[in-house]
Interface confidence: medium
Amino acid sequence: QSYSISQLDIFSQETPLDMAPASFDDQYAGCLADMTAALPDLNHSEFQANKVYADGWAQANNQWQERRAWGSVWGSLPPSPPGFRDEHGVALLAYTANSPLHKEFNAAVREAGRSRAHYLHHFSFKTLHFLLTEALQLLRSHRSRGCQQVYRGVHGLRFRPAGPGATVRLGGFASASLKNVAAQQFGEDTFFGIWTCLGAPIRGYSFFPEEEEVLIPPFETFQVINTSRPTQGPARIYLRALGKRSTYNCEYIKEKKCRSGPCWLGSS
């Protein structure tokens, strides 16, 4: 048995391959600056509430500083796109490392969109969710690369199949690899071939750069092209990018503004 890239979804149970309706999928459209301004206080309160996050962030921050100081040893950090800050790099390192943070974060993301209240009051990874979302936007626009074929191996995750033609999302942030062999090696339960248009290559910011990792955001939608479940070997699922779909947008900022004056929340 084996594990997937960046400890992908290990230890998980059977899950439907669907639109992941409970996933928190905010794209922060129109509130990036407001969110950035809110980060210091928010991050501090989340550290207090979530030890795994605090410890994971501290370790990743140490690693980021080490890589900055000893770039020639690690292979120098790639040129960062405009707007890319240290905290984006730390967030990507924290996410890709072999620590429980990755698993807990994605489990929380999959549930945080059950309701707006659930996100606001029970999701203690708001900072990390925002930083990863923004980091992927920045990296994708910087690379100006269009869509790409990636591979994702998942261990311990059984999917209730969606038929060809179904529209699905991956439910959380999903790590995949540009290298077929890496994905197959680290997931013997389900193997995905994915044509992604919103995933961003994060090689230079990954704890394990050689995996040629691509990170796919939770709001990207895909069409199921084909599925197979052979008697031996992993189930195989092939997905093609369709677009993006979010139920939520700027929920934290909306809530902050509501606290300081009249507000209108719209349908979300």
């Epitope: 048995q1 084996s2 594990y3 290990i10 230890f11 030890k51 795994v52 410890d55 994971g56 370790q59 690693q63 490392a97 072999n98 620590s99 429980p100 943070l101 698993k103 807990e104 062999v181 890496a182 090696q185 680290f186 704890f207 394990f208 050689e210 995996e211």
Partner: antibody, heavy 117, light 106 residues
Framework: QVQLQESGPGLVKPSETLSLTCTVS????????WSWIRQPAGKGLEWIGR???????NYNPSLKSRVTMSVDSSKNQFSLKLSSLTAADTAVYYC???????????WGLGTMVTVSS | EIVLTQSPGTLSLSPGERATLSCRAS???????LAWYQQKPGQAPRLLIY???SRATGIPDRFSGSGSGTDFTLTISRLEPEDFAVYYC???????FGPGTKVDIK
Amino acid sequence: QVQLQESGPGLVKPSETLSLTCTVSGGSISSYYWSWIRQPAGKGLEWIGRISTSGFTNYNPSLKSRVTMSVDSSKNQFSLKLSSLTAADTAVYYCARDGWGRVFDIWGLGTMVTVSS
Amino acid sequence: EIVLTQSPGTLSLSPGERATLSCRASQSVSSSYLAWYQQKPGQAPRLLIYGASSRATGIPDRFSGSGSGTDFTLTISRLEPEDFAVYYCQQYGSSTFGPGTKVDIK
């Protein structure tokens, strides 16, 4: 620095359940995965399973039906239960930290467990 | 499941000599996931090399790792008396270990 110490019975009867505990000292248990690995006398190493402080577990398929792992963050401890023991389970049992580099970077000293009537 | 094979089973050398240990995987292994451990009698294993070629903290520079794909090598450039031990390679993906190579004094 972080140190690990296994504890539990040295002798267990066949068909019974082995219970071992690993105590983590000198550091936080929360940022890592924690594993159990065993080694029969004169033989190689066999990974048993791993756990996180949130209780996410992952077991070696060959042992999965007999293994249960748990964690008590307040005591900085994690535990192994292995049921339906046979003589083939006689081994030195190690606990180890699953480091961020995806390796077992810190090991306990090991505890010898003999399965015999 | 990836199977690791180590060779030779036993390597008999003298202090000061160079030791070359081989680890072969049944299918391609990402080098991020290949590690080497040293184990002396009555002791727990100790991490030597991770990521195929990175030395763990406190490991002397006479130990080096190399390789990619299916073939990996641990080299001890000049054997010291304390280096005589059993060496295991490990693939993190499946947390499997090779059977070990014993380096003993000729």
